[in-house]
Every structure is written in C-alpha cells, then in structure tokens.
C-alpha cells in the first residue's frame, strides 16, 4: 500500500486521537518509506557484500544521486522553509528514475520495491500541497531519465548490485535529512 495503514505498531496513539495533521501525515509517510527501504536493504545485503564496503570505496560512482547540502536551506544553519521544501520535492522527483530502476532488482521483495515507489509518489503529492512556490520546482526531463534508465540496466551484474546499494543508501539518507527538516516546519 502506498499509504501506511492507520497507526503502525511502532507508534502509540492517545485514545480517541484526532485525525492526523498534514505534518504528521508527511512524517508518517516518510517513516513508512524508510521501513520499506530497510526491508530492501536487508535483501541487498544478504545477496552481496556491498553493505560492508566503506563510503569512500563506494564514492567513486557516476550516479548523480540527490544529496542535502547546507545551501539547500534544510540545515539548522541558514534554515529556510520554502527553499528547503523545494529541495526536498525536487530531490524526490529526481529519485523517481532510480526507484524505477529498483523495480526489477528484487526477488523476494518485489512488492516492497513497488510500495516504496508508490509511497514516494504519494509523499511528493503531500509535499506539493504544502509548498507555496511550485514554480521553483524543476521536474526531471523524461528523455534524460529514459536514457539514464537504459544505461543503468545495461551495466554488468556487479555494477547493478553496487547501483542498487547506493540508491537505497542515498535515498534513506535523503529521506532522513528531509524528515529532520520537515519537523522544524
């Protein structure tokens, strides 16, 4: 399911809880996606030794995965709600092609990979409702995405395993940075 079902077992709701606010719904949606990533990472780590590789060893890759930096306005120093929100939405839109790549990369967690992809689409919709300056959000070019997808799928097995690991790790990190920033809004 693209949206978490009610209160998950990890959360304790007060009796007769009010309906979730927009912020709570976004927070919960991110946590739901993080659960999905965690499950996918388990399968990836069981299949290959990528997870033991250091960050430095994996840094030499040609993937242009979105990353949060101080200039994006999401860090405490220079925090800017609107700039940050634009960065989060833009980053998630950029991740979509990589999430599409993940769709055929899992055997036992195929449904989980689809859930992460669909849940991310829902998250983007939630965030777009929250954003005031939608004009500042640049949508990735479909043609560029299509050729990137073809290129990634043409890699050898080892590189595909590496790519899968890097996407999951970077996406997790991006979501966590986003989660922290959104809680300040």
């Amino acid at each position: 399911a693209p949206v978490p079902p009610g209160e998950d077992s990890k959360d304790v709701a007060a009796p007769h809880r009010q309906p979730l606010t927009s912020s709570e719904r976004i927070d919960k949606q991110i946590r739901y996606i993080l659960d999905g990533i965690s499950a996918l990472r388990k399968e990836t780590c069981n299949k290959s030794n990528m997870c033991e590789s250091s960050k430095e060893a994996l840094a030499e890759n040609n993937l242009n995965l979105p990353k949060m930096a101080e200039k994006d306005g999401c860090f405490q120093s220079g925090f800017n709600e609107e700039t940050c929100l634009v960065k989060i939405i833009t980053g998630l839109l950029e991740f979509e092609v990589y999430l599409e790549y993940l769709q055929n990369r899992f055997e036992s967690s195929e449904e989980q990979a689809r859930a992460v992809q669909m849940s991310t689409k829902v998250l983007i919709q939630f965030l777009q409702k929250k954003a005031k300056n939608l004009d500042a959000i640049t949508t990735p070019d479909p043609t560029t995405n299509a050729s990137l997808l073809t290129k990634l799928q043409a890699q050898n097995q080892w590189l595909q395993d590496m790519t899968t690991h890097l996407i999951l790790r970077s996406f997790k990190e991006f979501l966590q940075s986003s989660l922290r920033a959104l809680r300040q809004m």
Epitope: K10, D11, V12, E24, D27, R31, L34, S38, K55, M68, E70, C74, F75, Q76, S77, R169, K172, E173, Q176, S177, L179, R180, R183, Q184
Partner: antibody, heavy 122, light 105 residues
C-alpha cells in the same frame, strides 16, 4: 560495543574558552541516522541539552547558548569537539557526550559517556 | 521551547511498590518522549523511547504511556536497584528539553 568518553580540562578560569572532546567507538558518525550530542548537568540539578551534530554535518544548538557554542566532528578520528566561549562560574557542571541512532530520528540518547566535571573558578 | 514539567519532584516508596511518575509537555510532542534513569555519580541511562518502547535490556517492570501531552512512567514491583532519579525528555522539537527530574527514594 558502543563507548563514548569525554576529555578536557577539569578547571577553567572565567572568560576562558572550554574545549571538550568526545572520543567514541563501536559506531560511525558517517552512518545516516547517527548523531552525537552534548548535555550538561550542574551539581544537584537537571540535565540541559547543549548541542547535537548529525552524520550529514547538520548542527543544532541550544538557543540560549548558541552564540557561545561550536560543535564539530572528525569522522576519521571518531571524535566530536564542543567549544564553549566566555566561561562563567554558572557553567560549572558535569558535561556528557551521548549518541542518538534511530532511522526515524527520534533523538533518544541511547549511549552516554561517563561525564567530565568542569569547574569554572578564578 | 517545549517546557517539560515532572511530578512529583520526589517520591518515597518501598520495594515491591508500584510507582507512577508523570511528565507534561507544554505543547504537542506526538510520541517523541524518552525516559532516563540516573544514579548518583553516574551518567543517565535510557529506559524508554518513543513513549513506550522499552530499550533492549531494560526490565519489563518499566513501562510508558501517553494521554495527549501527559506522559507516564510506571514501575511495577519496585526493586532495590530502581531507587534513582528519573528524567523525561522531549525529542519532537529543537531545542531538546528535559524535565526537572523525579527522585525516587
């Protein structure tokens, strides 16, 4: 196993700058979801949160002390350093460093150092 | 800042008793609450996070609950090693803030 240890001067003079180092092992500050923070406790009083630094170098400070605090990390050395300027006798306290590690960023501090007592006196 | 208040500030109890400590947040903090135990001369020790999640290794006699902005730490059947000071901490908003503590004696 996770360990953290604070080091630094036990006695500082008023107006001086305090530099404390937290050296940790058993985890990496380059792992997403990890943060290391500083908390202090004046003798017989409550805990006071000072600062927190995250894996991605985002830094959060207590607003009342922000102008006096700087937190930095050295991932390769497994160290976090806190500097506090213009020390005053009211800053006399046990200073703790602690770790937070949670995928959902709930910031509960699951491992603490033993603490170091810093006395500010002339 | 989110102000955390704790009651009582101290409580006397005997081994085997059931003890309840309450913590109130000045604004909604959702489930972002942790409880710590501190013994004299020692660092605090995390007992409970996310309102009611028991940290691994913590005895099941400790439990946490929530009602709105009121949070409760309950110790059923008090043991000799439970005599200590207990602090709550909200982790929803920066700055992270602690309660003033409850001394269990």
């Amino acid at each position: 196993q996770v360990t953290l240890k604070e080091s630094g001067p036990t006695l500082v003079k008023p107006t001086q700058t305090l530099t404390l180092t937290c050296t940790f092992s058993g985890f990496s500050l380059s792992t997403s979801g990890v943060a290391v923070g500083w908390i202090r406790q004046p003798p017989g009083k409550a805990l006071e949160w000072l600062a927190l630094i995250f894996w991605d170098d985002d830094k959060h400070y207590s607003p009342s002390l922000k102008s006096r605090l700087t937190i930095t990390k050295d991932t390769s050395k497994n160290q976090v350093v806190l500097t506090m300027t213009n020390m005053d006798p009211v800053d006399t306290a046990t200073y703790y460093c602690a770790r937070s590690y949670d995928d959902y960023l709930y910031y509960a501090l699951d491992y603490w150092g033993q603490g170091t007592l810093v006395t500010v006196s002339s | 800042d989110v102000v955390m208040t704790q009651s009582p500030s101290s409580v006397s109890a005997s081994v085997g008793d059931r003890v309840t400590i309450t913590c109130r947040a000045s604004q909604d903090i959702d489930n972002f609450l942790a409880w710590y135990q501190q013994k004299p001369g020692k660092a605090p020790n995390l007992l409970i996070y996310k309102v009611s999640s028991l940290r691994s290794g913590v005895p099941s006699r400790f439990s946490g609950s929530r009602s709105g902005t009121d949070f409760t730490l309950t110790i059923t059947s008090l043991q000799p090693e439970d005599f200590a000071t207990y602090f709550c901490q909200q982790t929803r908003r920066f700055p992270l803030t602690f309660g003033p503590g409850t001394k269990l004696e």
